[in-house]
Interface confidence: low
């Protein structure tokens, strides 16, 4: 057969769907690889062909669109399962072609089982809510296109196993779940089950997401440098190891890049010749405020090193701060026989 532009297996789009639920999967060609949409391709006389490779097999097979109750069907650029079965797991390929043009891409589809409390191997999206910030909502995700607007589905929300009803600060409102005032105790997995009728059958869509309550922008402050500070002096003798921690607290800020760095005599450590190492550790509070510690280490400090300026810098979306460490050379204790004797005028 003639050459086909093969985009390979698009593992970036690992699609997971629940067993025994409807699934609609768009051909990724039009979403991510081609510069035109399905309508344009169809108008130009191109045909979209689907086939698949079962899990643990190499053989490409056509998809059977003649199953009872049209369990698998194609509509425009969408492959429909009504519903999925566990053995639908495999690599699916959509190919767009006519006599002169061909382009195809494969993608993995995994049909996963869920247990009675909606636990499963499904990778869950995370939705962040600001702590004590007023009313915030999450929306039941990825249910568009499953039923027409004329159909009114029933939506049930769960927190873990619990149906959400008579919760103090969480109120189901159809496709939305409202948090009147989000608290740490609201952290957890939330599931919406959307039930809708179609051609005399009832289908369920299960969507689970993780809610993480994070620090509120109302409480956000510029970075705070806890160390170095004015109370600690790093007093060393030449030849000793110099260790200076730079410990910085960052308020949680959505999409903020938190940075900590050292300068020595105004230069980055990489740009100077002394043998310095920097080790970083990061910890987070329950509301995802962040504490970063960068320890500057010079194994065998020289008297020259002890005269340098060591400054810790920190930056977030809220601002930039800097603090110099107090470093000095330890004055050696006097040796009595020589120094004190000289002081008394001994010869």
């Amino acid at each position: 057969s003639e050459r086909c532009d093969d985009w390979g297996l698009d593992t970036m789009r690992q699609i997971q769907v629940f067993e025994d639920e409807p699934a609609r999967i768009k051909c990724p060609l039009f979403e991510h690889f081609l510069k035109f949409n399905y309508s344009t391709a169809h108008s130009a006389g191109l045909t979209l062909i689907w086939y698949w490779t079962r899990q643990d097999r190499d053989l490409e097979e056509p998809i059977n669109f003649r199953l009872p109750e049209n369990r698998i069907s194609k509509e425009k650029d969408v492959l429909w399962f009504r519903p999925t079965l566990l053995n639908d797991t495999g690599n699916y390929t959509c190919m767009l072609r006519n006599t002169t043009y061909c382009s195809k891409v494969a993608f993995p589809l995994e049909v996963v089982q869920k247990d009675s409390c909606f636990n499963s191997p499904m990778k869950l999206p995370v939705h962040k809510l600001y702590i004590e910030y007023g009313i915030q909502r999450i929306t039941c995700p990825n249910v568009d296109g499953y039923f027409p607007s004329s159909v009114k589905p029933t939506i049930t929300w769960y927190m873990g196993c619990y149906k959400i009803q008579n919760f103090n600060n969480v109120i189901p409102e159809g496709m939305n779940l409202s948090f009147l005032i989000a608290l740490i105790s609201n952290n957890g997995n939330y599931t919406c089950v959307v039930t809708y009728p179609e051609n005399g059958r009832t289908f369920h869509l299960t969507r689970t997401l993780t809610v993480k309550v994070v620090g509120s922008p109302k409480n956000a402050v510029p970075p705070v440098i806890h160390s170095p500070n004015d109370h600690v002096v790093y007093e060393k003798e030449p030849g000793e190891e110099l260790l200076i921690p730079c410990t910085v607290y960052f308020s949680f800020l959505m999409d903020s890049r938190n940075e900590v760095w050292w300068t020595i005599d105004g230069k980055k450590p990489d740009d100077i010749t002394i043998d310095v190492t920097i080790n970083e550790s990061i910890s987070h509070s329950r509301t995802e405020d962040e504490t970063r510690t960068q320890i500057l280490s010079i194994k065998k400090v020289t008297s020259e090193d002890l005269k340098r300026s060591y400054v810790c810098h920190a930056r977030s979306a809220k601002g930039e701060v800097a603090k110099a460490a107090k470093v000095k050379q330890k004055v050696p204790a006097p040796r009595y026989t020589v120094e004190l004797a000289c002081g008394f005028g001994a010869t």
Epitope: S116, C117, G160, Q165, H204
Partner: antibody, heavy 111, light 110 residues
């Protein structure tokens, strides 16, 4: 409230259906579990039906027990019982913390 | 999968004393743990759910704590009416598990 019924003396190998009758709340809003307790023993989970009608079972109960429901009842069908199935059978509301239990119904399996 | 080990099997306590009952899951159950009290001839009574939330009408002498795989029920200021068998139950998964309940702890009040 919850009330179990259907418990009786049966012979090994037959079948029996226990019924849990619900009042005061809707089964479309709650999960329901079945639990049993052999004389002088601890609580043993059998299985559970969620608010949407999906049923789930303990590994040992699969194939021998079936949970189903109507709008006001939850049934537990026991097939091919043995003397080890002699117990008081309870139904309870919810799964991750059952706040409402029936008084239980006694099933005795003896030849 | 999600097997529950409850200790001790039995404990004696004087009136006014404190009892600690432990429940360990074979893997993390993410706070989905309930505690029940059962007296002879009665169904279980829910004390605590979601690991630490007190059920309606239950005395604050009962306290639940823990996370991950390890959970604890503490009864302080024990009264003679607390003599009963106590069970933990994981509510994380009800599918294909051996038993969601722990083996039980008999509390004897002297």
């Amino acid at each position: 409230s919850l009330e179990e019924s259907g418990g009786r003396l049966i012979t090994p190998g037959g079948s029996l259906t226990l019924t849990c009758t619900v009042s005061g709340f809707s089964l479309s809003s709650y999960h329901m579990q079945w639990v049993r307790q052999a004389p002088g023993k601890g609580l043993e989970y059998i299985g559970y039906i969620n608010s949407l009608g999906g049923s789930y079972y303990a590994s040992w109960a699969k194939g021998r027990f079936t949970i189903s429901k109507t709008s006001t009842t939850v049934d537990l069908k026991i097939t091919s019982p043995t003397t080890a199935d002699t117990a008081t059978y309870f139904c309870a509301r919810d799964f991750a913390g059952s706040d409402l239990w029936g008084q239980g119904t006694l099933v005795t399996v003896a030849s | 999968a999600y097997d529950m080990t409850q200790t001790p099997a039995s404990v004696e306590v004087a009136v006014g004393g404190t009892v600690t009952i432990k429940c360990q899951a074979s893997q993390s159950i993410d706070y989905y743990l309930a505690w029940y009290q059962q007296k002879p001839g009665q169904p279980p009574k829910l004390l605590i759910y979601r690991a630490s939330t007190l059920a309606s009408g239950v005395s604050s002498r009962f306290k639940g704590s823990g996370s991950g795989t390890d959970y604890t029920l503490t009864i302080s200021g024990v009264e003679s009416a607390d003599a009963a068998t106590y069970y933990c139950q994981q509510g994380y998964s009800g599918n294909n598990v051996d038993n969601t309940f722990g083996g039980g702890t008999e509390v004897v009040v002297k």
